[in-house]
Structure formats: C-alpha cells, structure tokens
C-alpha cells in the first residue's frame, strides 16, 4: 500500500519561515503533487504549490521555493508576514497523484513544543485516499 509522509520544520534563523517536506512511498509513477495549507486541497485547504514532474513547478505566496528533492519527494519553503504568515499550528497537506495507485494525501503540522530548527523525523502521516 502506498504511503505519503509529511514533515514540517520551523527554521531557527527565521521564525516565520517553515520548510515542508513530503514524499511518496509507492511503486507508481507520480503525475502531480499539490501542497496546500489549512487542510486538504478541495476541503477548505488553499493550494501553495503544484509540482508536475515534466511540466515544472508553480507556487504562490507565501511559498518562496518549491522543489523536487528526488523523483518521489518534494520540499517547500514558506515565509510570510502579516495575514499570509503560517503559524505553529497550521496544517500542511501533500497530495500525490500517481499511476496506477490513484491519489494519496497526508497532512502534518509542526510537532508540539518543538524547538525552532528541530522537527520530528519524517514518518508516514495519516493517509487519506482521494477518490
């Protein structure tokens, strides 16, 4: 069964800066990755970045840099000020569309009482099947 993992980290140098890393643990071919915050995309969440393995990367504020780390994992750096700033309890979600498995999504947030610059190791988050 495919799994999606999500890791959220607050940067020690900039407290309004977050790094989100997501990965897909499956044998299928990834066709699209969507990163959202505030909940799953299409369920109250807002898209921050879209990453297509062949068509490139699109991102919107407060996303600063989205990138493919490997063929099955991505990272996104967020920074903001004022209304668009992420906060410590913000939920971030990554949705991987793959063939033939379909769409798999997982969400994560900053570990409770974590020190800036530290984060929990990337572990598979609760998996939501997107029909």
């Amino acid at each position: 069964t495919p799994e999606v993992w999500v890791q959220v980290r607050m940067e020690a140098t900039e407290l309004s800066s977050f790094t989100i890393r997501c990965g897909f643990l499956g044998s299928g071919s990834i066709s699209l990755v969507t990163v959202s915050w505030g909940g799953p995309n299409g369920a109250g969440g807002t898209t921050l970045a879209v990453l297509h393995p062949e068509r490139g990367i699109r991102q919107w504020a407060p996303a600063r840099q989205a990138r493919w780390e490997t063929q099955s994992s991505i990272s996104l750096i967020l920074e903001g000020s004022g209304a668009s700033s992420p906060c410590a309890n913000t939920t971030f979600c990554c949705k991987f569309a793959s063939f033939p498995e379909g769409s798999w999504e997982a969400c994560g947030s900053l570990p409770p009482s974590s020190d800036p610059g530290l984060s929990a190791p990337p572990t598979p988050a609760p998996i939501l099947r997107a029909d």
Epitope: G42, T46, H52, R55, G56, W60, W68, I74
Partner: antibody
C-alpha cells in the same frame, strides 16, 4: 469540454485602463491556476502573470508588475486581468491559459489609440 | 530571466518532407530532482491561440500526431516533424517551463511550398 471564453475587443485611449475577462467552463475553476499572456501583432508571446484561484494569490512578470492586476471571481468561474496606464505598446492580443498552458482562451484584442 | 532563442525564424518545405527547428535556452532547463527538462513546444495556426504540442522536452500532449517529436536536453532542444502536412502551417514556439518568469522563444514560422 474545457473552454475559456474571453471578453470582446477593446479600443482604449492612451493612459486609460482596460479589464479583460476569461470565463472558464467544463472543469472545476479552483483546480487549475490561470495564466495571462500577451501577443503583440506578428510577435512572440509574453507571460504577464498567473493567479491561484483558491485564494487569489498572483505571480507577476516583473515587466508588468505595478501595471497589471490579476483577480478571480470564484462564484462565476471568471478570471480578470486589468492593465493600467496604457500606451500604444500595449496594443496586442491577450490570452488567458489554464494550468500549464494546457488550454488557451479565445483571445482579446486590445487597441490603444487616441 | 531565461532567454529562449529559436532558429530559423522561418522555413519553407514541401508536404511530405522532414523538418527540424531549434530552440536554445540561456540556462539549463534540466531539473536535478526529476532529471526532466522543463521545456514545452506550442503550435499556433493563423488566427488561433497557441496549442500545446510537447512538454517535458519530449512528451507529446494527448491527441498530437506522432509525426511531431521533441528532443534535446539542458540548453539545446529540437522539434522535428517527420513528414510535414499542409495543416502544419503555423508558427512554432518553445517555452521555458523551468523557472519564473515563463518565457517563450521568438517562434519559427513554417510555410508549405
């Protein structure tokens, strides 16, 4: 069928503004970002910017930043581009294009003339 | 900004002939994570909006005839039409899909003799 229907041709005076619309149909409007592209007569294509329909967050080509404003109306599945302080150099066909430039609008001809 | 340079600016061929056109970028369009080249090709027929032909430098968009082939990597790319048809009369544009702002080449105008 996915379609992007744009507003009709515009004849505007130098210094004025123009607002072009792009109505999407055949898909969920908030699922795909929207691009705007300029094509001067007989010339190449210039990307103006894109907008995330989820929250109305835009990206702009630095060349158009400050003069172009991209907005969306989710209730009508319509994207808008406003261009201000027009000069003759802005006379062109303007296209909306959804997603990764997968589907293009019909185009809107803007003529700037006194 | 990444500058896209296409050549030739125009060419005239007879139906059935093979044609190749070039696109060069000022920076590499290869993504290190996916090992894919973020380059797209578009066809614009007279009086129509552009139409996506090829993305990822070599992947044909659904419905595009297999006589259209994209190739290349890094900064040098080629679009080949193996046997030109009358309906291929158009301007062909390449586009940087690698980094903002998305930029297009000046186009290659294909005329049929």
């Amino acid at each position: 069928e996915v379609q992007l229907q744009q507003s009709g041709p515009e004849l505007v005076k130098p210094g004025a503004s123009v607002k072009i619309s792009c109505k999407a149909s055949g898909y969920t409007f908030t699922d795909y970002f929207m691009n705007w592209v300029k094509q001067s007569h007989g010339k190449s294509l210039e990307w103006i910017g894109d907008i995330n329909p989820n929250n109305g967050s835009p990206n702009y080509n630095q060349k158009f930043k400050g003069r172009a404003t991209l907005t969306v109306d989710k209730s009508s599945s319509t994207a808008y581009m406003e261009l201000r302080s027009l000069t003759s150099e802005d006379s062109a066909v303007y296209y909306c294009a959804s997603g990764y430039f997968d589907v293009w609008g019909t185009g809107t001809t803007v003529t700037v003339s006194s | 900004d990444i500058v896209m340079t296409q050549s030739p600016s125009s060419l005239s061929v007879s139906a059935g002939e093979k044609v190749t056109m070039s696109c060069k970028s000022s920076q590499s369009l290869l993504n290190s994570g996916t090992q894919k080249n973020y380059l797209a090709w578009y066809q614009q027929k007279p009086g129509q909006p552009p139409k996506l032909l090829i993305y990822g430098a070599s992947t044909r968009e659904s419905g595009v005839p297999d006589r259209f082939t994209g190739s290349g990597s890094g900064t040098d790319f080629t679009l080949t039409i193996s046997s030109v048809q009358a309906e291929d009369l158009a301007v062909y544009y390449c586009q940087n899909d690698h980094s903002y702002p998305w930029t297009f080449g000046g186009g290659t105008k294909l005329e049929i003799k």
